[in-house]
């Protein structure tokens, strides 16, 4: 086989997804390794090829894009699972090539199971809230691109095992969860579940994050307060953007 620029296994992108949920995974080549995007590559006559190696196997296999109900599909530079299965776990490779050029990268995908209270081996992003500092919000993360804006999903928020309802200072507002005044008792894991219809089927997206309420330090200034509104995503959680 011809020489191919092999970026190896990108272990910085330890992608974890829940079993039986949709997942959209962008080829990392265009995000981290190449200086051009998919559209440019496609216009230049380059083809994006996907294949994978199952967990505990060495054999590279093509991905089966002819499964019932198009369970796995490719759209531009995104690999779609609608939905995932436990045995989709493995190392996935995207290769960009034509007759004169070749570049590829692999990344691990782990399909994980959650329990009845949303606990799982998933690595959770942490969102800091400042104690007793006005209204602060967290947003259900990594749900962009799953459904068009014409689709109106339903969103259910949980703290630990329990639906958030009739809480004194925590109010679900669609994709956002508002903390009227953050207290130490608000520390914990928060889960949003987004439910949406697609082609006569119902899909669910489960996203859990850890809220950490920290003391405010006036000397840090307003800049830190604005920074607190942003979710501190671990590097491996950038895969949906």
């Amino acid at each position: 086989s011809e020489r191919c620029d092999d970026w190896g296994l990108d272990t910085m992108r330890q992608i974890q997804v829940f079993e039986d949920e949709p997942a959209r995974i962008k080829c990392p080549l265009f995000e981290h390794f190449l200086k051009f995007n998919y559209s440019t590559a496609h216009s230049a006559g380059l083809t994006l090829i996907w294949y994978w190696t199952r967990q505990d196997r060495d054999l590279e296999e093509p991905i089966n894009f002819r499964l019932p109900e198009n369970r796995i599909s490719k759209e531009k530079d995104v690999l779609w699972f609608r939905p995932t299965l436990l045995n989709d776990t493995g190392n996935y490779t995207c290769m960009l090539r034509n007759t004169t050029y070749c570049s590829k990268v692999a990344f691990p995908l782990e399909v994980v199971q959650k329990d009845s209270c949303f606990n799982s081996p998933m690595k959770l992003p942490v969102h800091k809230l400042y104690i007793e500092y006005g209204i602060q919000r967290i947003t259900c993360p990594n749900v962009d691109g799953y459904f068009p804006s014409s689709v109106k999903p339903t969103i259910t928020w949980y703290m630990g095992c329990y639906k958030i309802q009739n809480f004194n200072n925590v109010i679900p507002e669609g994709m956002n969860l508002s903390f009227l005044i953050a207290l130490i008792s608000n520390n914990g894991n928060y889960t949003c579940v987004v439910t949406y219809p697609e082609n006569g089927r119902t899909f669910h997206l489960t996203r859990t994050l850890t809220v950490k309420v920290v003391g405010s330090d006036i000397s840090r200034g307003l800049n830190d307060i604005f920074e607190a509104q942003k979710i501190e995503w671990h590097e491996h959680h950038h895969h949906h953007h």
């Epitope: 039986d20 309802q165 669910h204």
Partner: antibody, heavy 117, light 107 residues
């Protein structure tokens, strides 16, 4: 597509037990709740309880606590509902209903249990 | 337990009519309300979840609304295949509880 296939009709004596099965396919059995709902002849729907096969967590309606047992076999993707100390008023159609969250998205075809001496 | 009261218990309407069924909870249920359709001799089917979310594959003539303790299911233009009994169900607080049902017939 999601399918829930329940076991066949049963005729039982008062005081005995019945075990109804619900075989699931077309979704990840371990990752959804399995509910059990019953409907007496000509009556409405009555929720009995639910189980999360992934970890075995169960919730029961107070009315059935101690008399109903919900179990799940992940290896065969089958859920079971056992009701003991049967009485005539337990005569009903028993349904299993799957829900990723709390709504019961899909239902089995129902199992008629007749309690008669 | 939360009590769910449905009204009317039965109704008869003509094809094309707008049909409204109401459901009242004994306490606030924060929009955690489902509607199910059950045709004679069949298992129930989920129509609407979380007050207004149309379940996949359900015709758009069905809609839901409400808040607090009072909720409504509307069929904008009744069709012959809509003959069934409709149940509301709260899932705010365990145990989940159903309304008594509304039987819909064609005149």
């Amino acid at each position: 597509q999601v399918q829930l296939v329940q076991s066949g009709a049963e005729v039982k004596k008062p005081g005995s037990s019945v075990k109804v099965s619900c075989k699931a396919s077309g979704y990840a059995f371990s990752s959804s709740w399995m509910n059990w709902v019953r409907q007496a002849p000509g009556q409405g729907l009555e929720w009995m309880g639910r189980i999360y096969p992934g970890d075995g967590n169960t919730h029961y309606a107070q009315k059935f606590q101690g008399r109903v047992t919900l179990t799940a076999d992940k290896s065969t993707s089958t859920a079971y509902m056992e009701l003991s100390s049967l009485r005539s008023e337990d005569t009903a159609v028993y349904y299993c209903g799957e829900g990723y969250l709390d709504p019961m998205d899909y239902w089995g075809q129902g199992t008629l249990v007749t309690v008669s001496s | 337990d939360i009590q769910m009261t449905q009204s009317p218990s039965s109704l008869s309407a003509s094809v094309g009519d707008r049909v409204t069924i109401t459901c009242s909870a004994s306490q606030g249920i924060n929009n955690y309300l489902n509607w199910y359709q059950q045709k004679p001799g069949k298992a129930p089917k989920l129509l609407i979840h979380y007050t207004s979310g149309l379940h996949a594959g359900v015709p758009s003539r069905f809609s839901g609304s409400g808040s607090g303790t009072d909720y409504t299911l509307t069929i904008s233009s009744l069709q012959p295949e809509d003959v069934a009994t409709y149940y509301c169900q709260q899932y705010s607080i365990l145990p989940w509880t159903f309304g008594g049902g509304t039987k819909v017939e064609i005149k």
